[in-house]
Interface confidence: low
């Protein structure tokens, strides 16, 4: 139809720190190019209808749909959103196009939805569609980086299937231990996927996104190191890629490296060398043993062997499933005041856990240290000596593990007490949970030294919020105390608190602090 | 990696209706978005319907509109394609997919990470 006008639908998406975001709502500045949205006829509807590409909205972002006219003659329009009408001010630019923006400033879930754009020119009517929904993050996913090698090149290009696209970056250092951590000035970030220096000492691939940040080192025998007092142990699951370098420094060329899988040679294609001279002309050779997708039969012993060192060797072990081993029996840790203490987990795992500790509902965060004989390890020693339940919680993409744990602090009872019409009660949250007397003042006992045993209830609870155990104990009212003043006492090997409390006749009970 | 595992095809008349069922076997299968795609003796592979990860939003395709149902049951893992007065033209493989938006801001059709075997709908008097 040839009455029909040309559309274009444009998004645009602005920049969290753009301050000309809104000023104008019907012509903010554009803060990056326009991304064209389609805006296709829709076939079979009745009427003119134009449909743009959907529009996907981070959570706080702020866009502008933007829709350009180029029909003769005036257009006069109007939003709709949600059966409500906006209001709509079309204007023209330098192509003297018809413009209409609607801006959507700090995107929420309720500003998800369609909204349509009618537009009237002299010609003829309109209406086009937009659908904005939230990005659901749920959809997004942040895999462990894996090695390959380069095609024809002796390189590795670092793979991290992930969504959205993820950074990959390199991380060497050239140091030993302690010294390669993150944030130490011996460390080297590339932010590149292929690496073709691979004499390193520590090498790992990082990629990360939204969703956070995974990494992968290259799992290294160093023939120079002193061999681990445990044979290293590497695991991987059925389809994984397995790479191990072995690394050797002799003072000339005069040596080779060589693989084996449990006596036997690895077979051609499985492994490539590089060498390379250091700066004090000694001579560094590294050889790969590499299996594209790895399958059960390639679990066993790599030694590498060279010629002038004493060979190493590492257990490979292939698995279907991931896993976490760690022994999942609570424990209960008794403590002094003013003791210090962490709580520890011991886990071997694959692939490696994402964990979080928590008490009282409130999580914290975990961190993980890896031991030398494979096993790792998650310490949380910010309790604050608060007793109760403290929660470890591990998971990677196949196994799920919760270990709990209960915190009791050694103190003297501290002694709480309320009373109704019919009874007296007094808590306390002292540990070892106390035992309790009652004792009734009068005019015979004026140091309160007459034991009250009769109608005495004793009880332990859980306060659930933090997991700590409260005793209690009940006085039920009699006649032959209504009026005195009682005392409850509680006691454990720490020491002593009571509180005296009046009975008297119906109404508010004072409460005596005993000092 | 998940796998997508189609039921429910076979012989039916013109008029008449089918459930397909798709099972998933990942447990995070209630985040992707899922769909349906079928394809016909010699054409290309189009899509029919498609439900968000929530179940809040659908998609069809104009062609089915109306006859199709689609829904999911997240506690079980699976997709269902509720398909009534079917006509001689749905003949074809239909197959389950899974995916998501990999467009940080738009999105025009999901990509589809994951594909079924497919299952084989014949409809014909």
């Known amino acids: 139809n040839q009455d029909l006008p040309v559309i274009k639908c444009v998004l645009i998406n602005h920049k969290n720190n753009d301050s000309s975001v809104g000023k104008s709502s019907s012509y903010p500045m554009v803060s990056e190019s326009p991304e064209d949205l389609g805006c296709a006829l829709r076939p079979q509807s009745s009427g003119t209808v134009y449909e743009a590409a959907a529009v996907e909205v981070d959570v706080s972002a702020s866009i502008t749909l933007q829709v350009l006219v180029d029909a003769p003659g005036n257009i006069s329009c109007l939003w709709v959103f949600k059966h409500s009408s906006l209001n709509c001010q079309p204007h023209f630019d330098l192509q003297n196009r018809g413009v209409v923006s609607m801006v959507i400033l700090k995107m929420t879930e309720t500003q998800a939805g369609e909204y349509l754009l009618f537009i009237q020119s002299e010609a003829t009517n309109y209406t086009i569609l937009f659908t904005v929904s939230i990005r659901n993050t749920l959809l997004y996913t942040l895999r462990r980086p894996y090695f390959r090698k380069m095609e024809n090149q002796d390189a590795l290009v670092c793979i991290s299937e992930s969504v959205p696209e993820p950074i990959v970056e390199w991380v060497l250092c050239d140091s030993q231990g302690e010294s390669c951590k993150e944030e130490s000035p011996a460390v080297v970030k590339k932010e590149e996927k292929v690496l073709h220096e691979l004499f390193g000492t520590d090498i790992r691939c990082c990629a990360r996104n939204e969703l956070g940040r995974e990494c992968t080192r290259l799992f290294t025998i160093d023939l120079n190191q002193t061999p681990q007092t445990t044979l290293p142990q590497l695991f991987l699951k059925v389809g994984e890629p397995l790479w191990i370098r072995c690394k050797a420094v002799h003072v000339n060329h005069g040596f080779g490296l060589t693989w084996e899988l449990e006596n036997k040679a690895l077979e051609e294609g499985n492994y490539f060398e590089m060498s390379t001279y250091s700066t004090n002309r000694t001579m560094i050779r590294i050889l790969f043993a590499f299996v594209s997708s790895v399958a059960r039969n390639d679990t066993g012993y790599y030694t590498c062997s060279s010629s002038k060192h004493p060979s190493q060797s590492a257990l490979v072990t292939i698995v279907e499933k991931g896993f976490i081993n760690a022994t999942n029996s609570s424990e209960d840790y008794e403590i002094d005041q003013y003791e210090e203490f962490c709580f520890s987990v011991r886990f071997k795992a694959y692939p490696q856990i994402r964990c979080t500790w928590t008490f009282s509902r409130k999580s914290f965060p975990c961190e993980q240290k890896g031991l030398d004989n494979g096993y790792s390890i998650s310490k949380f020693c910010n309790h604050k000596h608060q007793p109760g339940e403290y929660i470890f919680h591990a998971e990677n993409d196949d196994a799920q593990f919760t270990k709990m744990f209960t915190l009791n602090i050694r103190r003297k009872p501290q002694v709480l007490a309320e009373a109704s019409a019919s009874q007296a009660s007094c808590f306390s949250d002292g540990y070892p949970l106390p035992s309790w007397t009652w004792k009734k003042c009068s005019d015979k006992s004026p140091n309160c030294t007459e034991e009250i045993t009769e109608g005495v209830w004793n009880r332990k609870a859980n306060r659930k919020v933090f997991g700590q155990w409260v005793s209690s104990s009940t006085l039920n009212m009699s006649e032959a105390i209504k009026g005195f003043l009682v005392k409850c006492c509680a006691y454990n090997s720490l020491g002593t608190s009571c509180e005296t409390i009046l009975l008297n006749s119906p109404g508010p009970f004072p409460f005596i602090q005993d000092n | 990696e998940v796998q997508l595992l189609e039921s429910g095809g076979g012989l039916v008349q013109p008029g008449g209706s089918l459930t397909l069922s798709c099972a998933a076997s990942?447990?995070?299968?209630?985040?992707?978005?899922m769909g349906w795609f079928r394809q016909a003796p010699g054409k290309e592979r189009e899509f029919v319907a498609a439900?968000?990860?929530?179940?809040?939003?659908?998609y069809y395709a104009d062609s089915v509109k109306g006859r199709f149902t689609i829904s999911r049951d997240n506690s079980k893992n699976t997709l269902y394609l509720q398909m009534n007065s079917l006509r001689a033209e749905d003949t074809a493989v239909y197959y389950c997919?899974?995916?998501?938006?990999?467009?940080?801001?738009?999105?025009?059709?999901?990509?589809?990470?994951?594909w079924g075997q497919g299952t084989l709908v014949t409809v014909s008097s």
């Open positions: 997919a899974a995916g998501g938006s990999t467009r940080v801001v738009v999105t025009t059709t999901p990509v589809v990470k994951y």
């Open positions: 439900m968000s990860w929530s179940g809040g939003s659908t």
């Open positions: 990942e447990r995070t299968f209630s985040s992707y978005t």
